[in-house]
């Protein structure tokens, strides 16, 4: 059946549309296109005679139509009036007619909208605000966005006027946000610039800080007042009801008992016209001076500088005390006190020496503490760490690397790829990576204060396919019943399954075997000699499955209790004594002999020719394994009889 397909169906003004003909019959004489749903000579657009390949414009031809030999009609530079139905009239060679109708709709390209507001500075809990999306456009849909999110459900939010108007009733400070409107029709969508709602609120009840109300004579009084307010509040201070100053902070140096009293902070919002006050009562006590700490070096460098901390003021016949981390001084060769205990010297500071440090002056009744002092020890950078630890990434994912090096002041970071500088940031982000992003990724950490730099290099491979894995071990020669061994399957890759086999079999169930790190690490706790087997790991991802070469665990064990052979203990005089000692051990043990406690030779076999009764005694074999650090021994008694006295005794060998 002859059909017309409009491509596209919804057309933007100024664009073009193709009326595509399907199932055009064969053996045609010609065809004509008409505007509308029927054949009407007054509304003919164009006709086409196949024999002459001649196209003839009709009354409705606008100059923007092109007819193709396959009968399809292209209309260019579309205008609103073009909306509607189009009819194709086909005349076959047998002069039988066939018709088909198609249609399309024309929509304007929307302009960028803007937001108008009926209230630019609404007051919290009082005003409403109506945002209107301009301009008003026919056949357009209106949408609203708050902080780039769709509108939350709230009884205070109301859409009206075909969603063109957004009203916020009873605004609150939380309504301070970015508002955008969007207009949509079937051919376009446009979003406005954001409008920030500026809600006037406050002041809330002010907060006076610090909270402490007790001070010593001679201290500075520094009170700060803050009240949440928009626009920011104007502050006034009153002491015992008397106006002092219009500032946010009240500072009175070197206070005395006379400064005790009630301190009032008043916050005023000129736009809302509201005032709020808070009162605090300050008490000043008369006491001896509070000690304080001075330092000869405020920014010492780790492992380089010494720091001398002195407790001030210097007072005769006074006992000085020191605390580090709220504890009394630890015993350390790097901590030295002067004769009067007033100066504490830290030799060759480390990053762990930051403190806090406090000194105290002891008087008759109590101990006065100084304020704590924290040392700013400059150190690092240490070797940077690049995370995550993956070395393999699949194409198409995002690569996000972060670098961190312990450093004070914090390190400045640079990234290089294959030696070429990329950027001076702590994080490196590359989206949608390909195999061309494989390479050497270097993070350089620099400490501007010390001038020191350290680098770490990581090889990144971008490949869907994983390489043949390998096994790394944290202990190549574990000791039996003592050590644990952690095997790790390399490389570490995203979206990868890790598997393990022992002697070609899947892992046995054992409380001494533990998988961790996404099955990438196999840990054997308390290894035994029976664990000396072939371990293989496998990796699998979307396109690969691969096994490592086997790694055989070399478990060090022994020496076990040795065995002396032959087992005979009685010999005839004149026989040869040939004793052999053996102990299960890895590596092979060192052997030594003692006869009646006297060291003999360091051999596995002890040979004595033509023994006599003088050779009676205790024969001890000692075994030692230098690798395990373990020793063992066994003692055997040998009796030698004069020949002929004891028949049936061994003649030796």
């Amino acid at each position: 059946k002859l059909t017309i397909e409009s491509t596209p169906f919804n057309v933007a003004e100024g664009k073009e549309v193709l009326l595509l003909v399907h199932n055009l019959p064969q053996h045609l004489f010609g065809y004509s296109w008409y505007k509308g749903e029927r054949v009407d000579g007054n509304r003919q657009i164009i006709g086409y005679v196949i024999g002459t390949q001649q196209a003839t414009p009709g009354p409705a031809y606008s100059g923007r139509e092109i007819i193709y030999p396959n009968a399809s009609l292209l209309i260019q530079n579309i205008i609103q009036n073009d909306t509607g139905f189009y009819t194709l009239h086909v005349i076959k060679s047998d002069l039988v007619n066939e018709e088909a109708t198609g249609q399309f709709r024309v929509y304007p390209e929307l302009p960028k909208p803007s937001i108008s507001s009926n209230n630019s500075k609404p007051v919290e809990d009082k005003d409403a605000v109506a945002f209107t999306c301009e301009p008003e456009t026919q056949d357009a849909t209106y949408l609203w966005w708050v902080n780039n999110q769709s509108l939350p459900v709230s009884p205070r939010l109301q859409l009206s006027n075909g969603n063109r108007t957004l009203t916020l009733f009873n605004v609150t400070r939380n309504d301070t946000a970015s508002y955008k409107c969007e207009t949509q029709n079937p051919v376009s969508a446009r979003r406005s610039d954001s409008v920030i709602l500026n809600v006037l609120y406050g002041p809330d009840a002010p907060t006076i800080s610090p909270l402490n109300t007790s001070y010593r004579s001679g201290e500075n009084l520094n009170l700060s007042c803050h009240a949440a307010s928009n626009p920011p509040a104007q502050y006034s201070w009153f002491v015992n009801g008397t106006f002092q100053q219009s500032t946010q902070e009240l500072f009175i140096p070197n206070i005395t008992v006379n400064n005790s009293g009630s301190y009032t902070c008043q916050a005023h919002n000129s736009d809302t016209g509201l005032n709020r006050t808070t009162v605090t009562t300050i008490t000043v006590y008369a006491e001896p001076p509070k000690p304080f700490i001075t330092s000869n070096n405020s920014n010492p460098v780790e492992d380089e500088d010494a720091v001398a901390l002195t407790c001030e003021p210097e007072i005769q016949n006074t006992t000085y005390l020191w605390w580090v981390n709220n504890q009394s001084l630890p015993v350390s060769p790097r901590l030295q006190l002067s004769n009067d205990n007033r100066t504490l010297t830290l030799l060759s500071v480390t990053r762990n020496d930051v403190g806090p440090y406090e000194c105290g002056i002891q008087n008759e009744l109590s101990v006065d503490h100084s304020d704590p002092v924290i040392l700013n020890v400059l150190y690092g950078p240490d070797d940077p760490t690049i995370s995550p630890s993956y070395t393999y990434y699949r194409p198409g994912v995002n690569l996000s690397l972060s670098c961190h090096a312990a450093s004070n002041p914090p390190a400045q970071y640079s990234w290089l790829i294959d030696g070429n500088i990329q950027q001076h940031t702590q994080e490196l982000f590359i989206s949608n990576i390909t195999e061309k992003n494989s390479g050497l990724y270097t993070c350089q950490a620099n400490n501007s204060a010390s001038g020191h730099s350290r680098t770490t290099v990581k090889t990144i491979t971008v490949s869907a396919e994983l390489p043949k894995p390998s096994i790394s071990s944290n202990n190549s020669k574990p000791v039996e019943d003592k050590d644990a061994v952690a095997f790790t399957c390399e490389p570490e890759a995203q979206n990868t399954t890790y598997l393990w086999w022992v002697n070609g079999q899947s892992l046995p169930v054992s409380p001494r075997l533990q998988l961790s790190n996404g099955n990438r690490t196999l840990t054997l706790f308390n290894v035994t000699r029976n664990d000396a087997r072939a371990y293989v790991c496998g990796i699998q991802n979307s396109v690969s499955a691969n096994r490592s070469d086997p790694v055989t665990l070399d478990v060090l064990y022994g020496p076990d209790t040795p065995i002396i052979s032959p087992p005979d203990s009685s010999y005839l005089s004149g026989a040869n004594l040939n004793l052999s000692c053996h102990s299960a051990s890895n590596p092979s043990p060192q052997y030594s002999w003692r006869i009646n406690g006297i060291p003999q030779q360091h051999t596995q076999v002890l040979f004595i020719a033509k023994i006599t009764p003088n050779n009676n005694g205790t024969y001890a074999c000692f075994v030692s394994n230098l690798a395990t650090g373990r020793n063992n021994s066994i003692v055997k008694s040998i009796t030698v009889s004069a020949s002929g006295t004891s028949p049936g005794l061994s003649a030796g060998a």
Epitope: T434, S463, A464, G504, A545
Partner: antibody
Framework: EVQLQQSGPGLVRPSQTLSLTCTAS????????MHWVRQPPGRGLEWIAW????????EYAPKFRGRATMLADSSKNQASLRLSSVTAADTAVYYC?????????????WGQGTLVTVSS | DIQMTQSPSSLSASVGDRVTITCSAS?????MHWYQQKPGKAPKLWIY???NLASGVPSRFSGSGSGTDYTFTISSLQPEDIATYYC?????????FGQGTKLEIK
């Protein structure tokens, strides 16, 4: 025994959507990636896509992106392929395929193949 | 996309002959994999990760190569080896196959 059994119509009309299902037995599809590969008559092999049934992650060949959809139903141990707006050029034998560890060995399994003809 | 060029596209050899098929990738790949396909059957993985024989594959088959150039070899052709062989790369998406080499007996 590991098996992949394919099902789906052998004839699809142009512009329609081709739908094929691959039912696995002998292993759990959640633990493996399922692939689809096709082979037009007398031609070579062409990879379409894979899916990770555990989380629904997919990767498509650019040529099929936007037209192919891979889905998995772990409860039925099934993976499926939908290819929309087909034309005669989509006539091919379609295979589902999985690469798994069977014991100690990495094994490659394929469905029996489904010849899909696109014709009106 | 990585293009895979297999040569020859077909070859005729006698039983006992040494047969070599080459596969060239347009960019460097990690490994090459080879499939055997007999008429009307699904492909079978024959050699994986360049040189490893899949389960049940006779030792007369071997694979080698690196980077962009890879080789598939049958040391002594047997009648049951008659099939079409495809190379495949899995290093980057989309995964791509060679156009195939059809092996026939003279």
């Amino acid at each position: 025994e590991v098996q992949l059994q394919q099902s789906g119509p052998g004839l699809v009309r142009p512009s329609q959507t081709l739908s094929l299902t691959c039912t696995a037995s002998g292993f759990n599809i959640k633990d493996n990636y399922m692939h689809w590969v096709r082979q037009p008559p007398g031609r070579g092999l062409e990879w379409i896509a894979w899916i990770d049934p555990e989380n629904g992650d997919t990767e498509y060949a650019p040529k099929f992106r936007g037209r192919a959809t891979m889905l998995a139903d772990s409860s039925k141990n099934q993976a499926s392929l939908r290819l929309s707006s087909v034309t005669a050029a989509d006539t091919a034998v379609y295979y589902c395929h999985v690469l798994i560890y069977a014991g100690y060995l990495a094994m490659d399994y394929w469905g029996q193949g489904t010849l899909v003809t696109v014709s009106s | 996309d990585i293009q895979m060029t297999q040569s020859p596209s077909s070859l005729s050899a006698s039983v006992g002959d040494r047969v070599t098929i080459t596969c060239s990738a347009s960019s460097s790949v990690t490994y090459m994999h080879w499939y055997q396909q007999k008429p009307g059957k699904a492909p079978k993985l024959w050699i994986y990760s360049t040189s490893n024989l899949a389960s049940g594959v006779p030792s007369r088959f071997s694979g080698s190569g690196s980077g962009t150039d890879y080789t598939f070899t049958i040391s002594s052709l047997q009648p049951e080896d008659i099939a079409t062989y495809y190379c495949q790369q899995r290093s980057t998406y989309p995964l791509t196959f060679g156009q195939g080499t059809k092996l026939e007996i003279k």
